[in-house]
């Protein structure tokens, strides 16, 4: 209907115009995890903070045991950051050891997880070798891109290893989706 | 009023609808840093390009004296990207030194100042140790999250040292928002 | 339009209203590049999946030969990720060999390239120091942000050594915009 | 240190129009909020109105906004109140606050009586 | 408006008792302020945001609530806490004040 007047009333017009700020929308914060059972080739996922200080889900888009469910088809912006902190990773002792030195990593995944597909899908991934030379070292991944969502769809952030997951912040690690 | 055809005109539709072109939205640019003074506890914010090169604000989103202003309440999606850069990090002259190897570091914050808080918020922060073993040593931190912000609410980028931001190109380091 | 009830249908209402259902849209994932030429002073440009697993394009948003079209004049927010990896990096092999310690880098642009202008435009830079002390590295390069472009404007990824980029997961290395 | 400096004239005739100034000192006001707080003899609080330096953005208090008016002087750094149609009901303690970003700063009032 | 009604008006109490003071708001807030303010003097924030401490505040001071009820405690009063306190939400315009709370010493 770009830049056009209103059609006269007995016309319809099909396009699903609505209101923006009746869209589903939700910005998680970190919360101190406490460990939970996963598959043996999936890494942890994280729960999240859905209602207090930053954080927040609306319009129909909720929050529920580590999961933001999806309540509408559409395309999604979804984002993530993780801070991770650690002591000095194995690599650089393993280094000062002689041995070979296999960095060590650090990955953020977030994953879809939909009725009609049987395998989680990996939508995004953020991952980086930590060989860190300094006793203790701390840094973020951030991911962010746009999906096409179905009605029902469950998505969650994923890490390598949630001990190393920086939780002290609202800031500092996050999870988000909102609909275009 | 999704999926739904415009109803007769004796009608009363009262969702907000509104078109997207006339929304709040800024991209600033980096600029050459001048010091001014800040709080002790607080780090110093940068300031921006708002007109020139790739730079804008539009629909009542302003930018003055570091700040933007939010002209209307609602859902913000706020971006930023500090390319930081400098020479070897004392980290790695202390380890040679053998001395304690507290690592470096460099930090981003969106911050928020709202007149309903007599603190300011910290909305997103990115934070990383900074113990390279080259000489001279460059990287970015982004950020971007959804937040809801009130009319009236103003936002800054802070950073941990304004002598390592790299100012010398517009897409190195940059500042935005846009209501969703 | 604003919690406004529709006008009578005899009046006009010239704001752009439109579903958000049909705007530009894509996100486009990464495919194992093969060698193209290239200007000597500009990066390679990658090229992309825009059909298969995550990738889409749509509503006049096309995919040709490593470029996004922009079909339509507006505000969008862009984005890619580009996940390096390498074996040590020569800055460290350099080290140890008492020659002086220049970094080497990696360097992701999203590049616009328009009619009215003769020269790219890079519209948003990515570039990090690359010292690793490990033998194998691997780190995302993120980049996000909002711009005014016009129709018939192309957005292309470059990247500073197209071998190092990691093809191998679409949820790794991606590409992609929106019209707001 | 962060001070705040209300001045103006101790005495305003029935009618005529209230003018305060306040005079930051120690801090950018444009990087907070300023407002105006009074309160009447023997009275609570009641807040008037404030403003954002940084915008020139003002909130007033519904009950007052026909006569209130609150602007700035970045320049100077300084935030300007003016009441008109005064009666003797405005006769009070008008405090000049920062407040928004920072923690709360009070000027230490200026006392304005409103007589002929 | 938002009405800020503040209990009780006045009251006395030994030093080292733990005094409570409410404040009722007419709709939900997310931020509650309490201030003190003696005699001749500019109010002092004592507490933000419902419950944080303002800088510089004794720990014995501290306040708890949400939505619309709100309670400011001293926990053990003391003679130079002789003052009058206002609750204040600063979300609804106007921003409003409490009637205040006279606390004196037996």
């Known amino acids: 209907l770009k830049g056009q007047e209103f059609a006269p009333s007995h016309q319809q017009v099909y396009a699903p115009l609505r209101a923006d700020g009746d869209k589903p929308r939700a910005h998680l914060t970190v919360v101190r995890q406490t460990p939970t059972q996963h598959f043996k080739n999936q890494f942890p996922a994280l729960h999240w903070e859905h209602e207090l200080g930053l954080a927040f889900t609306k319009n129909r888009m909720n929050y529920t045991n580590k999961f933001l469910l999806i309540p509408e088809s559409g395309d999604y912006f979804i984002y993530s950051q993780v801070t991770f902190r650690g002591m000095t990773s194995e690599c650089s002792e393993i280094r000062q050891a002689g041995r070979p030195n296999k960095p060590d990593s650090i990955t953020v995944v977030i994953t879809k997880v939909t009725d009609s597909y049987p395998e989680p899908t990996q939508l995004l991934m953020g991952t980086k070798s930590v060989c860190e030379v300094g006793s203790n070292w701390f840094q973020p991944i951030y991911l962010g891109a746009m999906f096409s969502l179905q009605e029902g769809d469950k998505l969650m952030v994923n890490v390598s290893d949630i001990s190393l997951v920086d939780y002290t912040k609202e800031d500092k690690t996050f999870f988000g989706a909102f609909l275009l | 009023l999704k999926g739904q055809e415009f109803a007769p005109s004796h009608q009363q539709v009262y969702a907000p609808l509104r078109a997207d072109g006339d929304k709040p939205r800024a991209h600033l640019t980096v600029v050459r840093q001048t010091p001014t003074q800040h709080f002790k506890n607080q780090f110093p914010a940068l300031h921006w390009e708002h007109e020139l090169g790739l730079a804008f604000t539009k629909n009542r989103m302003n930018y003055t004296n570091k700040f933007l202003l939010i002209p209307e309440s609602g859902d913000y999606f706020i971006y930023s990207q500090v390319t930081f850069r400098g020479m070897t990090s004392e980290c790695s002259e202390i380890r040679q030194a053998g001395r304690p190897n507290k690592p470096d570091s460099i930090t981003v914050v969106i911050t928020k100042v709202t007149d309903s808080y007599p603190e300011p918020t910290q909305l997103l922060m990115g934070t990383k140790s900074v113990c390279e073993v080259g000489s001279n040593w460059f990287q970015p931190i982004y950020l971007g999250a959804m937040f809801s912000l009130q009319e009236g609410d103003k936002l800054m980028v802070n950073v941990s040292d304004i002598s390592l931001v790299d100012y010398t190109k517009e897409d190195k380091t940059f500042f935005g928002a846009f209501l969703l | 339009l604003k919690g406004q009830e529709f006008a009578p249908s005899h009046q006009q209402v010239y704001a752009p209203l439109r579903a958000d259902g049909d705007k530009p849209r894509a996100h486009l994932t990464v495919v194992r590049q093969t060698p193209t030429q290239h200007f000597k002073n500009q990066f390679p440009a990658l090229h992309w999946e825009h059909e298969l697993g995550l990738a889409f394009t749509k509503n006049r948003m096309n995919y040709t030969n490593k470029f996004l079209l922009i079909p339509e004049s507006g505000d969008y927010f862009i984005y890619s990720q580009v996940t390096f990896r390498g074996m040590t990096s020569e800055c460290s092999e350099i080290r140890q060999a008492g020659r002086p310690n220049k970094p080497d880098s990696i360097t992701v642009v999203i590049t616009k390239v328009t009619d009215s202008y003769p020269e790219p435009t890079q519209l948003l830079m990515g570039t990090k120091s690359v010292c690793e002390v490990g033998s194998n590295w691997f780190q995302p390069i993120y980049l996000g942000a909002m711009f005014s472009l016009q129709e018939g404007d192309k957005l292309m990824v470059n990247v500073s050594d197209i071998s190092l980029v990691d093809y191998t997961k679409e949820d790794k290395t991606f590409f992609g915009a929106f019209l707001l | 240190q962060v001070q705040l400096q209300e001045s103006g004239p101790g005495l305003v005739r029935p009618s005529q129009t209230l003018s305060l100034t306040c005079t930051v000192s120690?801090?950018?006001?444009?990087?907070?909020?300023m407002h105006w707080v009074r309160q009447r003899p023997g009275r609570g609080l009641e807040w008037m109105g404030r403003?954002?330096?940084?915008?020139?953005?003002?909130k007033y208090n519904p009950s007052l906004k026909s006569r209130v008016t609150i602007t700035r002087d970045t320049s100077k750094n300084q935030v300007s109140l003016r009441l008109s149609s005064v009666t003797a009901a405005d006769t009070a303690v008008y405090y000049c606050?920062?407040?928004?970003?920072?923690?709360?700063?009070w000027g230490q009032g200026s006392l304005v009586t409103v007589s002929s | 408006d938002i009405q800020m009604t503040q209990s009780p008006s006045s009251l006395s109490a030994s030093v080292g008792d733990r005094v409570t003071i409410t404040c009722r708001a007419s709709?939900?807030?997310?931020?509650m302020y309490w201030y003190q303010q003696k005699p001749g003097k500019a109010p002092k924030l004592l507490i933000y945001?419902?419950?944080n401490l303002a800088s510089g505040v004794p720990s014995r001071f501290s306040g708890s609530g949400s939505g619309t009820d709100f309670t400011f405690t001293i926990s053990s009063l003391q003679p130079e806490d002789i003052a009058t306190y206002y609750c204040?939400?600063?979300?609804?315009?106007?921003?409003?004040f409490g009637q205040g709370t006279k606390v004196e010493i037996k």
């Open positions: 204040q939400q600063w979300e609804g315009n106007p921003r409003t």
């Open positions: 120690g801090f950018d006001i444009q990087d907070t909020y």
């Open positions: 945001g419902a419950s």
């Open positions: 709709q939900g807030v997310e931020y």
């Open positions: 403003i954002d330096p940084a915008s020139g953005h003002t």
């Open positions: 606050v920062m407040s928004g970003g920072v923690p709360d700063v």
